[in-house]
């Protein structure tokens, strides 16, 4: 199809080489309530284009995205050629940053309901650049946490070094929905609820003498509880003795509950005590068996191929630790009688 009639938007993505970062493009097709409509491109130059309100935002789930190769080749369907780019309804998600994402992206509705070739499309010229060292040292992260039940804020990473007074007007989106009243470089959240978790996008316009473009940043916001004040507790084993059969295989499970920590480095390991000696056992990897907002339950097993007489004299100790402290639970094996 002919893309010469597409409306054009220029965007800049300045990514940090230090952090994982995502990016999004919205298919900003004209809506009936907007002043710019799509017009039929089959009219002769002397005819006045017949303005057609295109489609409401509710219809935008069925759009097609293409990339325009720089060498002038035909348009490429995004879904077929770019595994690191995902289409979700009318939004294009870039999962990894890189200058190779620079280029022209075109979106248009899949179904053209008019008998004419309707030039109803948007061309987005995306420029992707790594952030220079000269940029602000303490720019806001692309991953921000909000503490449930408290007051918090979401900062636009590309503007976080500017004061509110010198900041340009910002356009914010939450999960693709325009937040029309939020216009500053920082959104104040009076009281944080689960509702506030999501993908936020902040846009502002930058101009030079020649042209203007939209600078965009994406912020993943997570709602969290406060860091735990407790050391982990061991849920299993509960008993300090365990009846076993000699010569049989045995698995002892250690399950521990760790309270939420923003920087989470849980330790769960088994070691063996035999008279004055003690040593750590190499056991299978720990696995998370339940994770909630407040805590996580992690399990790690010790496996004995067969229980020996020597094992009855040893103590098997599960050791768990977080930043607050550690807890241990020891198990003595006891031979099952008759």
């Amino acid at each position: 199809f002919n893309i010469s009639g597409c409306s054009t938007k220029k965007l800049l993505w300045t990514y940090s080489t230090r952090s994982e970062e995502e990016f999004v493009l919205f298919c900003d097709l004209p809506e009936p309530q907007k002043s710019h409509f799509c017009h039929r491109n089959r009219l002769s130059p002397k005819q006045v284009p017949e303005h057609l309100p295109f489609m409401g935002s509710n219809d935008l789930s069925d759009v097609q995205w293409y990339q325009q190769p720089s060498n002038g080749d035909p348009l490429e369907d995004i879904r077929k050629s770019y595994p690191h780019i995902i289409q979700d309804k009318c939004t294009l998600h870039f999962l990894t940053p890189g200058v190779n994402n620079s280029g022209s992206y075109i979106c248009r509705p899949k179904m053209i309901k008019s008998p004419y070739d309707v030039a109803c499309c948007v061309k987005m010229i995306l420029e992707v650049k790594p952030q220079t060292n000269a940029s602000c040292e303490y720019s806001a992260s692309h991953k921000q946490d909000l503490l449930l039940g408290s007051t918090g804020s979401i900062s636009c990473p590309s503007l976080s070094c500017q004061s509110d007074a010198q900041s340009p007007a910002v356009t914010w989106y939450k999960n693709g929905k325009l937040l029309s009243v939020e216009r500053s470089n920082r959104i104040v959240v009076d009281e944080v609820y689960d509702y506030h978790q999501g993908t936020y996008v902040c846009d502002y316009t930058q101009s030079d003498t020649v042209s203007s473009w939209t600078v965009r940043a994406v912020v993943q916001v997570r709602t969290i509880v406060g860091d735990t004040k407790l050391k982990p507790d061991i849920l299993d084993p509960v008993e300090d003795t365990l009846e076993v059969e000699l010569g049989k295989p045995l698995t002892i499970s250690c399950k521990a509950r760790f309270g939420f920590e923003r920087v989470f480095n849980p330790v769960i390991k088994w070691y063996i005590k035999d008279s004055d000696l003690e040593w750590e056992v190499s056991v299978p990897e720990a696995k998370s068996i339940k994770s909630t907002l407040k805590d996580e339950i992690i399990e790690r097993n010790i496996i004995l191929e067969k229980v020996t007489q020597r094992d009855l004299r040893r103590k098997f100790v599960c050791f768990v630790q977080n930043s607050i402290g550690n807890t241990t639970q020891s198990v003595q094996l006891k031979e099952k009688r008759g």
Partner: antibody, heavy 118, light 111 residues
Framework: SLEESGGDLVKPGASLTLTCTAS?????????MCWVRQAPGKGLEWIAC????????TYYASWAKGRFTISKTSSTTVTLQMTSLTAADTATYFC????????????WGPGTLVTVSS | DVVMTQTPASVSAAVGGTVTIKCQAS??????LAWYQQKPGQPPKLLIY???TLASGVPSRFKGSGSGTQFTLTISDLECADAATYYC?????????????FGGGTEVVVK
């Protein structure tokens, strides 16, 4: 409960401050304290809200910005300062409490009447 | 600011009948909408919040529905006591749950 006070008959161009006093609870996080007005025989019109928690954020209807100021003056009182009053500001002014993540008004005062007339 | 448009301005129905009031938001407000009932000389009373959740003590004859920009309040099995003016209200402002713009109101007359 909530009770408004300060309603009066004033001349055009005058200023007036209304006070909302809470009984049985004090303003805290999770509460928005707000002002709503209703001109005689007309509908409800939102004026402004203030968050009672630490951010102290204020929110105004676009028509109210600049002429109306909402403030939390204590843990149980909120005021609405009104300047350059005109006859169009004649209304019953209600104080209302918005709570939690539902954002609705679950508690209202009985209202106080402001009349602007020469 | 979001603009709330309520229709009709007035509606009349017989006791035992049903009335439907519509409310349209100028932008997507998800399900952050409340409905109030107001009788002359009284402050409004909350009926429904979050578009469809009945406030405490409100009879189940009152039903709220909708999300995004289109909302409806339906009152069935009308009683004389339902004669009042009904208002919708947007209850989200940006990302904060701030009660704000009201619809123009609908007067319900019960015959």
């Amino acid at each position: 409960s909530l009770e408004e006070s300060g309603g009066d008959l004033v001349k055009p161009g005058a200023s007036l401050t209304l006070t909302c006093t809470a009984s049985g609870f004090s303003f805290s996080s999770s509460y928005y304290m707000c002002w709503v007005r209703q001109a005689p025989g007309k509908g409800l019109e939102w004026i402004a809200c203030i968050y009672a928690g630490s951010s102290g954020s204020t929110y105004y209807a676009s028509w109210a910005k600049g002429r109306f100021t909402i403030s939390k003056t204590s843990s149980t009182t909120v005021t609405l300062q009104m300047t350059s009053l005109t006859a169009a500001d004649t209304a019953t002014y209600f104080c209302a409490r918005g709570a939690g993540s539902n954002g609705d008004f679950n508690l209202w005062g009985p209202g106080t009447l402001v009349t602007v007339s020469s | 600011d979001v603009v709330m448009t309520q229709t009709p301005a007035s509606v009349s129905a017989a006791v035992g009948g049903t009335v439907t009031i519509k409310c349209q938001a100028s932008e997507d407000i998800e399900s952050y909408l409340a409905w109030y009932q107001q009788k002359p000389g009284q402050p409004p009373k909350l009926l429904i919040y979050r578009a469809s959740t009945l406030a405490s003590g409100v009879p189940s004859r009152f039903k709220g529905s909708g999300s995004g920009t289109q909302f409806t309040l339906t009152i069935s099995d009308l009683e004389c006591a339902d004669a009042a003016t009904y208002y919708c209200q947007c209850t989200i402002y940006g990302v904060n749950f701030v009660p704000n713009a009201f619809g123009g109101g609908t007067e319900v007359v019960v015959k």
